[in-house]
Every structure is written in structure tokens, then in C-alpha cells.
């Protein structure tokens, strides 16, 4: 056990590998294709370690003469990812990325899978349906979230630190109760941002502080009772 | 894991004093406040204060205060609540805890009469 | 000091039923606490610590919720071994104060 000026406690969510999908149901196919129009583009905040789906606009695959995913990831040349009915072959261009495929023969099904989401897949992901009666689109800014890891612990008296490790977006953190508190953000070069509350408190009755981290990915709490002040002894309350 | 092992029930009489003594284990003991708590038969839970034992300093709830000692040997890893100028009404159980209140011993009955 | 209102003080559940107590800390001040289960004769038992963490051990029908000043215990589906009394303690501010206690009983 670490000594208490120093105790630490930690948090980390562990994930089963979770699937996420925007894709719409068999049934919604049949709806007209304005309401498609209307929803070319979606943001989309996926955890990271998780399974992704993203799915074309719903058109029947017999209307269908090609379909491509186009793919901008950061620092990356643009890849696209071509299916042409007519032909039934398949064409990519500057894919690197072996997480990112077709969910199963394209013919069959037009969405597109990421396996185990990274941060290097934040990017557009765009699905582009060439029909007879016209070009349908949906595209998706997908937006890796990285679930920060929690710490607290004392490093002087009546003074706590919360800092929330490589979240992405950066976290928020609050107090109870609330102290005389400074935050500072690091950014990491992965996109990830490190949040680092340092708090004090200077009423003694103040037994014990809870640090609260926010995150998109769930939130957290934390707690610590502080230490006493050096040379006090005796205190009735 | 924690384990707060705490002395034996105890039978006092009215105006006298009684020592409560909770062995602590499986923490760092200096690093820790260590609280006192009291139930008294059929009612609630009443905190009677707290020690932490790296430096002896000390709170006590008001309504103790002139009557409770809370001490600490930090070579046995003990704690000791003394209370003093006993009465009736301080018949109850009496229980050490630790770890922000997650640690708990298994309570020493204090029976005080006549 | 910092009250704290626990309520309902006792009631009279079905097995099965959902159940519900609060507590809410006085003067408006943000606190957070603890919950406990408490049968005759034994010390009381840690369930959820710090408002929402279900401890090691304890079935998932125990939850807690809230934040600030109120808080919610839950029992989703109470159980005949549920029968006991159930208290939450402050433990941000000195001294630390507990609610009066709620007695549940299995009808």
C-alpha cells in the first residue's frame, strides 16, 4: 500500500468488444429517397476497441450499378473502396488499413466494418451509391473516443490531484465540494488530451473530496480524505 | 483486505470510564484515518469521531467532546476510543472503521449500569 | 453540520416489488455518501460506495444514483434476505452524519 500522501486510486473501463452501428433496419429500405437525401451527413462518436458498421444509403442492392467508400483519414492519402454490380468486381485504391473492409461480399451487402476502432480512424467515411435514377450518398464523421484513465491522490497537505490520462475529447473534472482549484490540458500528438485538476482546501471540516470526471465515454468519480494539517491535534466540530 | 478486529464487550458502571480497542490490518495504518461510530440499542448510527494515526490528530463530534479520548499505537497498529464519565444512555455498540468508512470492525457492546 | 434526511423511515415491501430511498443532505451543499444494510445484531454492510459504485459481492438488484445534495437508493426486485434497515452516511464533511435509517420489512 502506497503511503497516503501518495495513495493513488485508478480507474480504467474495461470494454468487451462492443459493436456499434448506425445502420437502419431491412424495412426502412422501402423509404423514399428525399428522407435519404436529407441525411447525407452524421457524426458519429464510436469508442475506441469497439467494433464499427457503417452502412450506405438504403437502396435495394437490384437498383444498384456501383458503390464505393470513399475513406480521409488524417495524414493519409484517400482511399476508396469500389464494387461494380455490373462486372461484380471489387477495386480499392490506396487501402492500407486491414480493420477496414467490406461487412461481407459486396454484393450481398454494402456496409462497410471497422474491426477493433483506433484513433487512427477518426476521419470521413463516405458511401457513395451510383443508381439509375441518380447518385445517393451518406457520409459519416467518425470521431474515436478514448476513454481517459482516472487518478487521485494528495501531493501536499489539504491539496488533491485529479487528472483524467489520454482522453479523447478531453475530459471535464469537478469537485465536491468545490476548492480553490488551477486545470491544465496536454495534448498528446494521437489527438488525445490529458486534463490535470490540482485543488486545495482550506476549511478544515472538509473531510473528504470527491474528484468528477466527465467524459463522453461515461463518467467517473473518485474519492480521497485528505490529510490532517501538520501540527493540528485536536478539533471539535 | 482490511481487517478491524476490535476487543471484547464490556460492562461498566455509571460515572466510569471504558477502553475500546480496534487492531487494524491489511493497510498501511499511519495512512489512514481510522472513525469511530456508535449505535445504541435500537436506534441510528452516531459518528463520535476520528483519528489518523501517521500524526495523532484528532476530531471529535461536539457532543462528546470533553469525554472522548481517541488514541493510537502505531506498533500494534491499534486504535482506542476512550470514553469517559459514563451514563446509561451511552450503551450501545461501538464500532472502529476505515478506508473512508468501507472497513468495518464488528462492534464491542458497552453496557452501562447500576 | 450537514443533515441528512433519509425517507421513507420504514416500509412494508412485497418480494419482487421495486424500492426506493433517499436521502438529501441539508443547506443545499454538495456532499457525497455512502449506503448500508444493516441486519439486527450485525455491523453494517458497505453496498454502494461513493453514490453509484455497487461493492464487490453485492447483487446487482442494489443500485444508487443521484448527486449533489439528493441521492436514491434502489432495490430493483426486493428479495425475502432484503429485510433489514438501510442507512447512508455523509462522509465529505466533518462530522460525518448518517441518515435516520429506513426499516424494510417483506410483507
Known amino acids: 500500500q502506497p503511503n497516503n500522501s501518495l495513495m493513488l486510486q485508478t480507474s480504467k473501463e474495461n470494454h468487451a468488444l462492443a459493436s456499434s452501428s448506425l445502420c437502419m433496419d431491412e424495412k426502412q429500405i422501402t423509404q423514399n429517397y428525399s428522407k435519404v437525401l436529407a441525411e447525407v451527413n452524421t457524426s458519429w462518436p464510436v469508442k475506441m476497441a469497439t467494433n464499427a458498421v457503417l452502412c450506405c444509403p438504403p437502396i435495394a442492392l437490384r437498383n444498384l450499378i456501383i458503390i464505393t467508400w470513399e475513406i480521409i483519414l488524417r495524414g493519409q492519402p484517400s482511399c476508396t473502396k469500389a464494387y461494380k454490380k455490373e462486372t461484380n468486381e471489387t477495386k480499392e485504391t490506396n487501402c492500407t488499413d486491414e480493420r477496414i473492409t467490406w461487412v461481407s461480399r459486396p454484393d450481398q451487402n454494402s456496409d462497410l466494418q471497422i474491426r477493433t476502432v483506433a484513433i487512427t480512424h477518426d476521419g470521413y467515411y463516405r458511401c457513395i451509391m451510383v443508381t439509375p435514377d441518380g447518385n445517393f450518398h451518406r457520409g459519416y464523421h467518425l470521431q474515436v473516443l478514448v476513454t481517459p484513465e482516472v487518478t487521485l491522490f494528495q501531493n501536499r497537505n489539504r491539496t488533491a490531484v485529479c487528472k483524467a490520462v489520454a482522453g479523447k475529447p478531453a475530459a471535464h473534472i469537478s469537485w465536491i465540494p468545490e476548492g480553490d482549484c488551477a486545470t491544465k490540458q496536454e495534448y498528446w500528438s494521437n489527438g488525445t488530451v490529458t486534463v490535470k485538476s490540482t485543488c486545495h482546501w482550506e476549511v478544515h471540516n472538509v473531510s473528504t473530496v470527491t474528484c468528477h470526471v466527465s467524459h463522453l465515454t461515461g463518467n467517473k468519480s473518485l474519492y480521497i480524505e485528505l490529510l490532517p494539517v501538520p501540527g493540528a491535534k485536536k478539533s471539535a466540530k | 483486505q482490511v481487517q478491524l478486529v476490535q476487543s471484547g464487550a464490556e460492562v461498566k458502571k455509571p460515572g466510569a470510564s471504558v477502553k475500546v480497542s480496534c487492531k487494524a490490518s491489511?493497510?498501511?495504518?499511519?495512512?489512514?484515518?481510522m472513525h469511530w461510530v456508535r449505535q445504541a440499542p435500537g436506534q441510528g448510527l452516531e459518528w463520535m469521531g476520528n483519528?489518523?494515526?501517521?500524526?495523532?490528530?484528532?476530531n471529535y463530534d461536539e457532543k462528546f467532546q470533553g469525554r472522548v479520548t481517541m488514541t493510537a499505537d502505531t506498533s500494534t497498529s491499534t486504535v482506542y476510543m476512550e470514553l469517559s464519565s459514563l451514563r446509561s444512555e451511552d450503551t450501545a455498540v461501538y464500532y472502529c472503521?476505515?478506508?473512508?468508512?468501507?472497513?468495518w470492525g464488528r462492534g464491542t457492546l458497552v453496557t452501562v449500569s447500576s | 453540520d450537514i443533515q441528512m434526511t433519509q425517507s421513507p423511515s420504514s416500509l412494508s415491501v412485497s418480494v419482487g416489488d421495486r424500492v426506493t430511498i433517499t436521502c438529501q443532505a441539508s443547506?443545499?451543499?454538495?456532499?457525497?455518501l455512502h449506503w448500508f444494510q444493516q441486519k439486527p445484531g450485525k455491523a453494517p454492510k458497505l453496498l454502494i460506495s461513493?453514490?453509484?459504485n455497487l461493492e464487490d459481492g453485492v447483487p446487482s438488484r442494489f443500485s444508487g444514483s443521484g448527486s449533489g445534495t439528493e441521492f436514491t437508493f434502489t432495490i430493483s426486485s426486493l428479495q425475502p434476505e432484503d429485510a433489514a434497515t438501510y442507512y447512508c452516511?455523509?462522509?465529505?464533511?466533518?462530522?460525518?452524519?448518517f441518515g435516520q435509517g429506513t426499516k424494510l420489512e417483506i410483507k
Open positions: 472503521l476505515t478506508m473512508t468508512g468501507t472497513s
Open positions: 461513493g453514490a453509484s
Open positions: 483519528i489518523y494515526p501517521g500524526s495523532g490528530s484528532i
Open positions: 452516511l455523509q462522509f465529505t464533511y466533518i462530522p460525518w452524519t
Open positions: 491489511g493497510h498501511t495504518f499511519t495512512s489512514y484515518w
Open positions: 443547506q443545499g451543499t454538495p456532499i457525497n
